[in-house]
Amino acid sequence: QRFAQAQQQLPLESLGWDVAELQLNHTGPQQDPRLYWQGGPALGRSFLHGPELDKGQLRIHRDGIYMVHIQVTLAICSSTTASRHHPTTLAVGICSPASRSISLLRLSFHQGCTIASQRLTPLARGDTLCTNLTGTLLPSRNTDETFFGVQWVRP
Amino acid sequence: QRFAQAQQQLPLESLGWDVAELQLNHTGPQQDPRLYWQGGPALGRSFLHGPELDKGQLRIHRDGIYMVHIQVTLAICSSTTASRHHPTTLAVGICSPASRSISLLRLSFHQGCTIASQRLTPLARGDTLCTNLTGTLLPSRNTDETFFGVQWVRP
Amino acid sequence: QRFAQAQQQLPLESLGWDVAELQLNHTGPQQDPRLYWQGGPALGRSFLHGPELDKGQLRIHRDGIYMVHIQVTLAICSSTTASRHHPTTLAVGICSPASRSISLLRLSFHQGCTIASQRLTPLARGDTLCTNLTGTLLPSRNTDETFFGVQWVRP
């Protein structure tokens, strides 16, 4: 009976449910288009349960299919600003290991100041996700305007 | 053996899977920026399994991490209208209890007539979510254009 | 004890976790606004675990509440192009069986070149989802710009 009891933990402990929601920490230095993220209850409503941060980039700890979602809002932005500084583009991709490098999700701002999207994608343990923002406009660091997260969905 | 059997119900019964998808009922009176929601199979494809509606606002019944998503489309809207009535902003937040009041998700329409986004956030039993639409434009009540939902993801 | 062991498979095998992420294959012939999808590991990062494709349209194999998500980016598009070719609209709906035909999700491009959204909706075994793109602009087939997916959430 004890074995059946222990097995009950599978969904949460062994099977997955890895999840993370991150807030923007800072942008990279010039020539580095990556956004650098941070997470943890001390910072507000961001958290990491399973995945980890590696120098501000999100590293996956469990193989599976994940729902990846992101919202980025440009600070000091109006539709005029956005169109004048076009193209401003956000791309989410696997940036390491190099052998698995691929763009997963890409959006342009055009005349808007916010992009938001989500997708399902297979990710493997060790995959590091990078979010590249190209253009001169900077993202808002407000936690309700800019965030990035993943949710393990199934093996 | 019966105990192991009963335990099998955990994922659905005890562990969570609370979920709700709501459709717009009406906007608030002047000076009340909140959108008022409704849900239930008699209304179409909206539903509440766990969370409840309290005067048109969504109240959470189970602690956990939730995926919150929303789409709002402005009625009688073109990109010209949207920019002329800028700023029109949508914010989703915890509005009660007051001690936990916080904005979770915020988007401006700029030159667009629809906003859509989603995020992961910890919510606690008793948290009431409010969706505030500021500006003079009214939202569409078409069920495929304006909707709001939550999905329990993990404890 | 063996019975309790077998039951552990419920979440993955019996209980659901049907999931699919598709990439654009092609648009329909004139007068057919539907987008035709494809999926499978040989094509990249698209997949079908449970649902199936029927002539490029997604058919559901398990009753339940699903998270449906989509992103469509218009090819050869700028905010000027998008507004000049307005209205360009995307609608996701159940297109068969005819008795259950309904629009689930609808968005216009206005001055933008990408739409992205998601919603929870009940779907039944045999429901076929169609994605209709109306207007003269064509969607990008880049797999990080245009995709469509569903995720089983609960019974």
């Epitope: 230095p29 000091i76 001169t136 900077l138 808002s140 | 915020r106 | -």
Partner: antibody, heavy 122, light 107 residues
């Protein structure tokens, strides 16, 4: 077009409280995108940020003045105000109100009032 | 707090010449740096935000560059109305701070 206008006494005695009001037109202090701020400039010197108030009522002050400064907002009048307690002659300056655009970590100022000179003298 | 040091304190140039103003931060401010112009008896006016983005209505002769700790404001060809004091300001973190200013005067 957003316009800001400072008002208040031009002369304040040492140890008293300096009180200024900024009236906003062409925009709303209730907007959830802007940080309504006060900045001062002593005669012939540089600019010093004093603090801001956000639509929600949250405030942020310069630590060098934190114990003496209070910023408040009156959304019904579309105004925000500055109070600086226990003033000395070192507080003599032109005081500007301004609209801050950016995020909760920091803003820059895209619209300014014309400024009002406040002299601290007995 | 982050200290911003502007140099030179005064720049004497003739109309039509190129002006190069420098702002150095005591620690990295990423690209969160703005430039303002102030004329006597007037409020400052925002020229550049976030290192390189021209504010609405600012002529193309004004440009900003830099990242981290070193920033530059360039006026490609000075017009008579450009003679004024210029301030940099960081919004990387609180408290917001301004540089001491550079006066651009007619030679």
């Amino acid at each position: 077009q957003v316009q800001l206008q400072e008002s208040g006494p031009g002369l304040v005695k040492p140890s008293e409280t300096l009180s200024l009001t900024c009236t906003v037109s062409g925009g709303s202090v209730s907007s959830d995108y802007y940080y309504w701020s006060w900045i001062r400039q002593p005669p012939g010197k540089g600019l010093e940020w004093l603090g801001y108030i956000y639509y929600s009522g949250s405030t942020n002050y310069n630590p060098s003045l934190k114990s003496r400064v209070t910023i408040s907002v009156d959304t019904s009048k579309n105004q925000f105000s500055l109070k600086l307690r226990s003033v000395t002659t070192a507080d003599t300056a032109v005081y500007y109100c301004a609209r801050g655009d950016g995020d909760f970590m920091g803003v820059c100022f895209d619209y300014w009032g014309q400024g009002t000179l406040v002299t601290v003298s007995s | 707090e982050i200290v911003l040091t502007q140099s030179p304190a005064t720049l004497s140039l003739s109309p039509g010449e190129r002006a190069t103003l420098s702002c150095r931060a005591s620690q990295s401010v990423s690209s969160y740096l703005a430039w303002y112009q102030q004329k006597p008896g007037q409020a400052p006016r925002l020229l550049i935000f976030d290192a390189s983005n021209r504010a609405t209505g600012i002529p193309a002769r004004f440009s900003g560059s830099g990242s981290g700790t070193d920033f530059t404001l360039t006026i490609s060809s000075l017009e008579p109305e450009d003679f004024a004091v210029y301030y940099c300001q960081q919004r990387s973190n609180w408290p917001l701070t301004f540089g001491g200013g550079t006066k651009v005067e007619i030679k």
